[in-house]
């Protein structure tokens, strides 16, 4: 028998420095977690102790903090090289800065293979990107070889900016021939490493003949066997065992997100490459694990540029950006409108001639807007200003919801109106009218939404049974501020870009902004 140790990360999202327990900015260092310096300590410890070790990443290193905003992927290549990753799968966020923003900083600089079997380049891009990412890679591990096949969410064109010269195929259809090829080349230990979410990971384990292990990402799934060490609630045991259609037991793993855990899976193979046993657990990278001094020193060196960046002007406002709780928790506020407009703008994807865009709606809890920006400072807006408005380090995500769920959300928005509570919704692509004289749960008297399948966008009444795409903060997607109906009833959830980054990009693009209060939210019967 031969034993392999798979160390894995996924959805690190730019958390190069240690973070607080909730993966936001580290405040009290003695209680902080993760970060590449701490990760390196643990990886090196395992590499020294065990003979056959692979360090893998299942995608979405890009996007999430000011590190990515400033360094645009160069930081990913640099620190992943320093940690000596063995392979990485492409995630949807690796395309956030377009194909060029993937090729130059990461694909050309990485000293490890970057994989995806279901992304096919066409046209002029095919020759430019040839060999820079691969469908599979065979790696020598100790005295054996291990094949690694990559995959990426086929929803990437709706979630990021891969352009028109990359085709995202069905994962299972694309993976099978690559695995078959590895088999003909006498590779009998095969890992599928990819970024399509836990449900697809399980399908791959079930359907792709010859895959021995699946290491996934995208859904930020936390799996654990036994008592979990922090706040994350396990979605199942680690590893999650899937019985394949041909009767094999295939371990499936994922390691939550944000570099908080290091996935640790031990697999025992027989001489023919069959999995005999698999066990392990994610390792919580808490402060009991010291940060590696040389990596930490490198992080501190790279940090300097970030501090300079945060005070530079992104653009100007010629109006007061009202982000006060007195406005945003009670009525339409122009800071809410600005943020929602930025959220929609960040999700412009012309993927179908029938649609002007795939999504037109935004909702945003007023309690998430934490500060106004005064235009009387020469109109200057900096990253620092935006960090005061959006201090929680969240993301603006894409969900699919039924109209009936949206109606419930808007009822919840005003169910206890007047108490300055955070659930009051700011909107984009939505016209809502409330009648506060009616009882809670029955206060939405009009709810019109902007069409997407139209050449001239206009507002139509919400249909209860229709499925709508909506951009919203991850906080809401996870049921925050009492929006349990969103969490419970959402039909799909894809994590998006860092909130501050979305707004800063929009302001930089517009150069001068002047958001107004324009009647997106109205109150009827003169009760307000």
């Amino acid at each position: 028998a031969w034993e392999l140790t798979i160390l894995h990360t996924n959805d690190v999202h730019s958390r190069l420095e240690q973070t607080s327990e909730d993966s936001s900015k580290c405040v009290n260092a003695s209680r902080c977690m993760g970060g590449v310096a701490r990760l390196f300590t643990k990886v090196q410890q395992i590499r020294r102790a065990e003979p056959n070790v692979l360090l893998l990443d299942a995608g979405d290193q890009y996007q999430g903090t000011i590190w990515f905003t400033v360094y645009k992927g160069a930081e990913v290549a640099h620190f992943m090289n320093a940690l000596r990753y063995d392979a990485m799968a492409l995630g949807n966020h690796e395309f956030d800065n377009g194909v060029e923003g993937l090729i130059e900083p990461l694909l050309k600089e990485a000293k490890f293979p970057i994989l995806s079997a279901n992304i096919k380049a066409k046209g002029p891009l095919a020759s430019q990107i040839s060999g820079l990412y691969l469908p599979y890679k065979v790696l020598p591990v100790g005295d054996e070889v291990v094949g690694i096949v990559g995959y990426t969410s086929k929803e990437t064109p709706f979630l990021s900016n891969p352009g028109t010269n990359l085709v995202f195929e069905d994962e299972i259809t694309a993976l099978q021939p690559e695995v078959d090829k590895l088999k003909t080349l006498n590779v009998n230990k095969i890992i599928a490493l990819g970024h399509s979410g836990f449900e697809m990971d399980k399908l791959i384990a079930q359907k792709v003949r010859g895959v021995d292990v699946v290491v996934g990402g995208h859904s930020n799934t936390f799996l654990y066997t036994g008592n979990p060490p922090s706040k994350e609630v396990p979605a199942g045991k680690y590893p999650f065992i899937v019985t394949s259609d041909d009767g094999r037991k295939v371990p499936v793993v994922q390691a939550y997100a944000f570099g908080k855990y290091l996935g640790y899976l031990k697999i025992e193979f027989d001489e023919r490459g069959n999995v005999i046993s698999s066990h392990g657990n994610p390792i919580l990278l808490n402060s009991s694990i010291p940060e590696d001094p040389s990596i930490k020193a490198d992080i501190n060196k790279w940090r300097i540029k970030l501090d300079n960046y945060s005070t530079q002007e992104l653009g100007k406002t010629i109006v007061y950006l009202d982000g006060s709780s007195q406005s945003c928790r009670f009525r339409e506020c122009n800071m809410g409108n600005l943020i929602c407009d930025a959220m929609i703008n960040n999700n412009l994807r012309h993927t179908d001639e029938m649609f002007w865009n795939h999504v037109s709606m935004c909702i945003l809890n007023g309690g998430g807007i934490r500060s106004p920006i005064d235009e009387r400072n020469n109109g200057t807006i900096t990253w620092e200003n935006l960090a005061a408005v959006l201090p929680f380090g969240g993301t603006f995500d894409l969900v699919q919801l039924k109209g009936s769920t949206l109606k419930k959300a808007f009822e919840h928005s005003v169910h206890r109106y007047g108490q300055s509570t955070g659930e009051f919704l700011q909107v984009g692509g939505i016209h809502v009218v409330y009648d506060l004289s009616r009882k809670p749960g029955d206060r939405v008297v009009k709810l019109d939404v902007l069409c997407t399948k139209c050449r001239v966008p206009s507002y139509d009444p919400l249909k209860m049974d229709e499925v709508y795409k909506v951009i919203l903060p991850n906080f809401l997607a996870n049921g925050g501020d009492g929006f349990q109906m969103i969490k419970d009833e959402l039909l799909r959830h894809d994590s998006g870009d860092q909130d501050i980054n979305v707004v800063s990009t929009y302001i930089s693009k517009m150069k001068v902004i002047y958001p107004a209060v324009e009647g997106r939210i109205k109150f009827s019967t003169g009760s307000h």
């Epitope: 890679k137 020598p140 100790g142 005295d143 070889v145 006498n186 590779v187 001489e271």
Partner: antibody
Framework: QVQLVESGGGVAQPGRSLSLSCAAS????????MHWVRQAPGKGLEWVAL????????YYADSVKGRFSISRDNSKNTLYLQMNSLRAEDTAVYYC????????????WGQGTLVTVSS | EIVLTQSPATLSLSPGERATLSCRAS??????LAWYQQKPGQAPRLLIY???NRATGIPARFSGSGSGTDFTLTISSLEPEDFAVYYC?????????FGPGTKVDIK
């Protein structure tokens, strides 16, 4: 059928350099690791170097490490051996060999090219 | 580095006889042991890989056995074309070594 044809052998002075090539045909070159193996006149076989199917890993015998460099051009179906700081003991027939299965078998051999290091 | 020792250095036999060639490793080589045949003026030819698997086109009279440190190549009934030098070869951590060879000549 698989064919491996070595070239570039000849006479070189000690301390000088020589470059060997191997043209491969009859199989998908980019799918296979490739080796150089040598045989001094009247002696046994000595493994020299291995290069991974895509050129990403290289392995060398201690006797040539730091002096010889194995490389490949998959677009040209060609394997190379750059030999620097040649010594008299490098005199041998150099065989280009296909790795049939991840180092467990060296399944196809060229006819070899003779390298003579002499002053 | 793993050292391979082959015995005997020379084996003198007649056609039709059984040949038993031995290869011993200085430490365990798992299953990664192969056997090659070389005739004068020719390149070596793969006979056996992974200790006991016959290569494509190799006659059934050639067989390999053993594991760990002791391996054997058996030619059940020598044919005239089998008189040659036989080398064993191992791989450990991607470093390859050959044995010194056993010469099988006609008695």
């Amino acid at each position: 059928q698989v064919q491996l044809v070595e070239s570039g052998g000849g006479v070189a002075q000690p301390g000088r350099s020589l470059s060997l090539s191997c043209a491969a045909s009859g199989f998908t070159f980019s799918d296979y690791g490739m080796h150089w193996v040598r045989q001094a006149p009247g002696k046994g076989l000595e493994w020299v170097a291995l290069i991974w199917y895509d050129g990403s890993f290289e392995y060398y015998a201690d006797s040539v490490k730091g002096r010889f460099s194995i490389s490949r051009d998959n677009s040209k179906n060609t394997l190379y051996l750059q030999m620097n700081s040649l010594r008299a003991e490098d005199t041998a027939v150099y065989y280009c060999v296909r790795d049939g299965q991840w180092g467990s078998r060296l399944d196809y051999w060229g006819q070899g090219t003779l390298v003579t290091v002499s002053s | 580095e793993i050292v391979l020792t082959q015995s005997p250095a020379t084996l003198s036999l007649s056609p039709g006889e059984r040949a038993t060639l031995s290869c011993r490793a200085s430490q365990s080589v798992s299953r990664y042991l192969a056997w090659y045949q070389q005739k004068p003026g020719q390149a070596p030819r793969l006979l056996i890989y992974d200790a006991s698997n016959r290569a494509t086109g190799i006659p059934a009279r050639f067989s390999g056995s053993g594991s760990g440190t002791d391996f054997t190549l058996t030619i059940s009934s020598l044919e005239p074309e089998d008189f040659a030098v036989y080398y064993c070869q191992q791989r450990s951590n991607w470093i390859f070594t050959f044995g010194p060879g056993t010469k099988v000549d006609i008695k």
